[in-house]
């Protein structure tokens, strides 16, 4: 590229320039969770810490009652991941008497909730089979992508099973986004 | 946004801006790992390939001695991928013989270092179970989120077990940052 | 950072500023995929939706063949998910017999193409190992770092067999790119 | 089952402030949008604006921006409208809509005129 | 504002027959929505994201389109449909309805 298609004088007329500085940007951490209703056929949200610890949001970019608020439009990356532990799965006890099994699974689901559209839009899905040998099994979902996204616009994190959730440490279970 | 808001001589106030090809980035890529010493309860960090193929840094951005080093305050994307691999985990060996059993696990941490915190803390966590039925097993753990850093910070990958670190391919196990 | 370490005047010496919307960057979700003719050893390669739903290309950053195509040099980061699934892998069920087994595998590689050299650069690959009890089973892989490119680059994803890519939901399996 | 109800008076004055409260039942408010809408007589529909009831973020229709208001009371489960300065040209059946991760439902409408 | 221009105006028709409302948008839209008003009472969705069906809508209802040109049909009319029908882009601001389709019944 060369210098002079973006001098200052030229970009203001077509796109103003910003401080990075200046951007959205959040990064959540994981609470315990309470148990919450959910509708039907939809999954659990996750509520997240906002700004002990590890957690901010920053640049009107705000927190509240599980969403995060999108406060200018943009194109935004959009990261979570989703520790979950739990006991052997159902699927390898019911294999140990030998039928054949569905396994069970784990599902992180990134939602987009917009006031122009009556349903949720699912941004990004990390689903796994979880069919366990060992007693005590615990992993990871990790999702991250970018999505052009509408001032107004909120983002959850759904999960398949609010119990198996790992809440113990902020660094196992987050979720973030900030403005490109 | 209104283009005024955010014209030079507004922006010059509060927030310096920079052009972007001039911001902390680094890329690095595995390398064969050396056995090291570490402390008891503390996993060993990985050391890095930080300017053949594909690993660079670049923009003051330093590697050296198994850190990043920041080279000034702000909010980056950090991200790493190890991939593990290994023999029949010890796991499925003893549920064979019919005894209960913990898994065996692998665990990925990103870590900070910062010279005002006696402690290390944990950015970023990745850790799964690890109770295969096949004789080799292979898998990677991939972390990525946005953290405030402070100028002087290190930032550092462990793991639970060096000897499990896939070392063979620059693709496979990286870890890199860059400020937003 | 002092203010005017970035005066404008000093910026446009040696890095042009540039509007951060005006950047060339691409999320592109999964579609049905057609079987292909590949190279032996080699991976076939993924085609894309690069415009309907949750998928676009701005910024004369351009997909076309499969291929994500650089429109300029500098530092991008390019991410992909792709989501698995099958039946019961071979591995668990040569294991039932008695015998020692190699794994099946999955594996996801994204691949830089450059007129200038010959190979194709694996610049990130994911691979895991399948040996699943159950009869179903499916799990995603995920990518994603910082690679500088050159204008004219082009970009694909390859994955080690097209017949198990969930290809049901644009959330699932997704390839990505943008320029920092 | 839900339920949004508009209340408020029947007739307004020109030139004081129209004022509309919607009650909701049955959902979560703060999972949502609540939006405004009129149709006066004869006419067909417009948008007047909406909140993001968990954050109180607002978004109007340009050509009402500077006399329309709307609020939220989350303890009450409640949206506001208050539009100021009203004229003749306001009088119309005004509608509270939920929308945004839910299907879309609207109130039954409040008529309000403005006379002296 | 995104103008929406719908029509025609008013139809008539009979029984049976398949009814179509256009609605050209004054610049590309991704969402539009249908409703259906009846008299003195309140707007039903019935299609939203340009072709989805609203819960409980009935199968003859049908919507299409993209861009700036969108449709929406009625492929067996029905007594009970008789009313005005709406699109509405729910994207720039002001979100903007069209003036409205009445059908009646010949």
């Known amino acids: 590229l060369k210098g002079q298609e973006f001098a200052p004088s030229h970009q203001q007329v077509y796109a103003p320039l910003r401080a990075d500085g200046d951007k959205p940007r959040a990064h959540l951490t994981v609470v315990r969770q309470t148990p919450t209703q959910h509708f039907k056929n939809q999954f659990p949200a996750l509520h997240w810490e906002h700004e002990l610890g590890l957690a901010f949001t920053k640049n009107r970019m705000n927190y509240t009652n599980k969403f995060l608020l999108i406060p200018e439009s943009g194109d935004y990356f959009i990261y979570s991941q989703v520790t979950f532990r739990g006991m052997t799965s159902e699927c390898s006890e019911i294999r140990q008497a030998g039928r054949p099994n569905k396994p069970d699974s784990i599902t992180v689901v990134i939602t987009k909730v917009t006031d122009s559209y009556p349903e949720p839009t699912q941004l990004l899905m990390g689903t796994k089979s979880v069919c366990e040998v060992g007693s005590n099994w615990f992993q990871p979902i990790y999702l991250g992508a970018m999505f052009s996204l509408q001032e107004g616009d909120k983002l959850m994190v759904n999960v398949s099973d609010i119990s198996l959730v790992d809440y113990t440490k902020e660094d196992k279970t987050f979720f973030g986004a900030f403005l490109l | 946004l209104k283009g005024q808001e955010f014209a030079p001589s507004h922006q010059q106030v509060y927030a310096p801006l920079r052009a972007d090809g001039d911001k902390p980035r680094a890329h690095l890529t595995v390398v064969r790992q050396t056995p090291t010493q570490h402390f008891k309860n503390q996993f060993p960090a990985l050391h890095w390939e930080h300017e053949l193929g594909l690993a660079f840094t670049k923009n003051r951005m330093n590697y050296t001695n198994k850190f990043l080093l920041i080279p000034e305050s702000g909010d980056y994307f950090i991200y790493s991928q190890v991939t593990f691999r290994g023999m029949t985990s010890e796991c499925s060996e003893i549920r064979q013989a019919g005894r209960p059993n913990k898994p065996d696990s692998i665990t990925v941490v990103i870590t900070k270092v910062t010279d005002s915190y006696p402690e290390p803390t944990q950015l970023l966590m990745g850790t799964k179970s690890v109770c295969e039925v096949g004789s080799n097993w292979f898998q990677p753990i991939y972390l990525g989120a946005m953290f405030s850093l402070q100028e002087g910070d290190k930032l550092m990958v462990n793991v639970s077990d060096i000897s499990l670190v896939d070392y063979t391919k620059e693709d496979k196990t990286f870890f890199g940052a860059f400020l937003l | 950072l002092k203010g005017q370490e970035f005066a404008p005047s000093h910026q446009q010496v040696y890095a042009p500023l540039r509007a951060d919307g005006d950047k060339p960057r691409a999320h592109l979700t999964v579609v049905r995929q057609t079987p292909t003719q590949h190279f032996k050893n080699q991976f076939p390669a993924l085609h894309w939706e690069h415009e309907l739903g949750l998928a676009f290309t701005k910024n004369r950053m351009n997909y076309t063949n499969k291929f994500l195509l650089i429109p300029e040099s500098g530092d991008y980061f390019i991410y992909s998910q792709v989501t698995f699934r099958g039946m019961t892998s071979e591995c668990s069920e040569i294991r039932q017999a008695g015998r020692p087994n190699k794994p099946d595998s999955i594996t996801v590689v994204i691949t830089k193409v450059t007129d200038s050299y010959p190979e194709p650069t694996q610049l990130l690959m994911g691979t895991k190992s399948v040996c699943e009890v159950g009869s179903n089973w499916f799990q995603p892989i995920y990518l994603g770092a910082m690679f500088s490119l050159q204008e004219g680059d082009k970009l694909m994803v390859n994955v080690s067999d097209i017949s198990l890519v969930d290809y049901t939901k644009e959330d699932k399996t997704f390839f990505g790119a943008f320029l920092l | 089952q839900v339920q949004l109800q508009e209340s408020g008076p029947g007739l307004v004055r020109p030139s004081q402030t129209l004022s509309l409260t919607c009650t909701v039942s049955g959902f979560d408010m703060v999972d949502t949008y609540m939006h405004w809408v009129r149709q006066r007589p004869g006419r067909g529909l417009e948008w007047m604006g909406r909140i993001e009831p968990a954050s109180g973020h607002t978004k109007y229709n340009p050509s009402l921006k500077s006399r329309v208001t709307i609020t939220r009371d989350t303890s009450k489960n409640q949206v506001s409208l208050r539009l100021s300065s009203v004229t003749a040209a306001d009088t119309a059946v005004y509608y509270c809509v939920r929308s945004g991760g839910l299907p879309d439902v609207w109130g039954q409408g409040s008529l309000v005129t403005v006379s002296s | 504002d995104i103008q929406m221009t719908q029509s025609p105006s008013s139809l008539s028709a009979s029984v049976g027959d398949r009814v179509t409302i256009t609605c050209r948008a004054s610049?590309?839209?991704?969402?539009m929505y249908w409703y259906q008003q009846k008299p003195g009472k309140a707007p039903k969705l019935l299609i939203y994201g340009a072709s989805n069906l609203a819960s409980g809508v009935p199968s003859r209802f049908s919507g299409s389109g993209s861009g700036t040109d969108f449709t929406f049909t009625i492929s067996s009319l029905q007594p009970e449909d008789i009313a005005t029908y709406y699109c509405q882009q729910w994207e720039g601001n002001p979100r903007t309805f069209g003036q409205g389709t009445k059908v009646e019944i010949k």
């Open positions: 610049q590309g839209v991704g969402y």
